[in-house]
């Protein structure tokens, strides 16, 4: 299940991955040295019955329909890390692999 | 980040894991031999700013606030399998470990 990829011109209403650039400087996150910007992507769209479901559980909860369950929502189902250079609180430059920074795939869960 | 656990008596409004029993017979899924029922759990509740976020990405998308992003939603962040006995489409009895059947933890993503 590879998920759907869309862009700002897409007419897709279902759960889809869209491009999004995160600009650390625009956030005022000046402790990040590299990258200054990166391609993060995000998930948006509707989760119709049985569409792009990551887990069997999602379908089962829809069937059981418990109190307070809002139905599945369009959310990252595969994430990847990026490598970063940044300052720590001791003002040392740190190299690190930061998990959960890029959305590789979206689905309904 | 261990997530919150709630029950039907909880007054918690934030993202939480609730107990849910899935009953295959009640669904009419008569090809499942065992278990007939299992404790699946489900996720429900509100995702306030920075609460129970699984990924740094979730916070970054909230900051960037792109068109069509609905904000994070309460969804499974850790799942586990269950072992099952069931009939396949050739009417053979299969034993298998089925992934994504139990919610171990909920979070906002």
């Amino acid at each position: 299940n590879l998920g759907l990829d869309c862009d700002e011109h897409s007419s897709e209403s279902r759960c889809c991955r869209y491009p999004l650039t995160v600009d650390f400087e625009a956030f005022g996150w000046d402790w990040i040295i590299a990258p200054k910007r990166y391609k993060a992507n995000y998930c948006s769209g509707q989760c119709e019955y049985m569409f792009m479901q990551k887990y069997p559980h999602t379908h089962l909860v829809q069937q059981a329909n418990p109190r307070g369950s809002a139905g599945p929502c369009c959310t990252p189902t595969k994430m990847s890390p990026i490598n970063m250079l940044y300052f720590n609180d001791k003002q040392q430059i740190i190299y690190g692999k930061i998990p959960g920074m890029v959305v590789d795939r979206c689905g309904c869960s | 980040n261990l997530g919150l656990d709630c029950d039907e008596h909880s007054s918690e409004s934030r993202c939480c894991r609730y107990p849910l029993t899935v009953d295959f017979e009640a669904f009419g899924w008569d090809w499942i031999i065992a278990p007939k029922r299992y404790k699946a759990n489900y996720c429900s509740g509100q995702c306030e700013y920075m609460f129970m976020q699984k990924y740094p990405h979730t916070h970054l998308v909230q900051q960037a606030n792109p068109r069509g992003s609905a904000g994070p939603c309460c969804t499974p962040t850790k799942m586990s399998p269950i072992n099952m006995l069931y009939f396949n489409d050739k009417q053979q009895i299969i034993y298998g470990k089925i992934p994504g059947m139990v919610v171990d933890r909920c979070g906002c993503s």
């Epitope: 650039t21 400087e25 040295i33 590299a34 990258p35 200054k36 910007r37 990166y38 391609k39 490598n83 300052f87 003002q91 040392q92 430059i93 190299y95 692999k97 890029v102 | -």
Partner: antibody
């Protein structure tokens, strides 16, 4: 305007060390990181490391760790790159480059370091 | 470690379009910059963030990036564009391609 002026060419023997300087002008020295990049004759560009002129903290490319030291002198708005245990493969033009929001900009004029016995 | 691969040379007639490629694994997921280096000169940034031109860079320079390949395009190439061009991306370090020598014929 922003300018980076580097020290002159050097000839060194294998095993020796070299210290290249890069004097910045036309901007607030402590507000921008500085990179060092080298280019062997007829070859591509190779990133060596970065220094924060404000606090002096550094990060070096794995290849150069243990052999390179980057320092700065805020009183003269100068950064330095020292490379030790020189070998013939270190013969290259060494550049300093300011870390701008959009990339390495501008670059110094380069310093040729020749390692020869 | 991450690698960027460029063709060693590209030839183009004056006024024609020069296309320089830079390939790397899932390069489209990263932002790519391009540097121009004239003979005996220091590098100059001509494209950043795949497609953006710094101020002072002529409009004939453009960039794109998708899949495994980033491309620098010089439209209406002039004699002054004869230089080496290097692509660059951030992975676990600042990585440069090997460079492409653009020769303007005639």
């Amino acid at each position: 305007q922003v300018q980076l002026v580097q020290s002159g060419a050097e000839v060194k023997k294998p095993g020796a060390s070299v210290k290249v300087s890069c004097k910045a002008s036309g901007y607030t020295f402590t507000s921008y990181y500085m990179h060092w990049v080298r280019q062997a004759p007829g070859q591509g560009l190779e990133w060596m490391g970065i220094i924060n002129p404000s606090g002096g903290s550094t990060s070096y490319a794995q290849k150069f760790q243990g052999r390179v030291t980057m320092t700065r002198d805020t009183s003269t708005s100068t950064v330095y790159m020292e490379l030790s245990s020189l070998r013939s493969e270190d013969t290259a033009v060494y550049y300093c480059a300011r870390d701008e929001n959009w990339g390495f900009d501008p670059w110094g004029q380069g310093t040729l370091v020749t390692v020869s016995s | 470690s991450y690698e960027l691969t460029q063709p060693p040379s590209v030839s183009v007639s004056p006024g024609q379009t020069a296309t320089i490629t830079c390939s790397g694994h899932a390069l489209g997921d990263k932002f790519v910059s391009w540097y121009q280096q004239g003979s005996g000169q220091s590098p100059v940034l001509v494209i950043y963030d795949d497609t953006q031109r710094p101020s002072g860079i002529p409009g004939r320079f453009s960039g794109s990036n998708s899949g495994n390949t980033a491309t620098l395009t010089i439209s209406g190439t002039q004699a002054m564009d004869e230089a080496d061009y290097f692509c660059q991306a951030w992975d676990s370090s600042f990585v440069f391609g090997g460079g492409t020598k653009v020769t303007v014929l005639g």
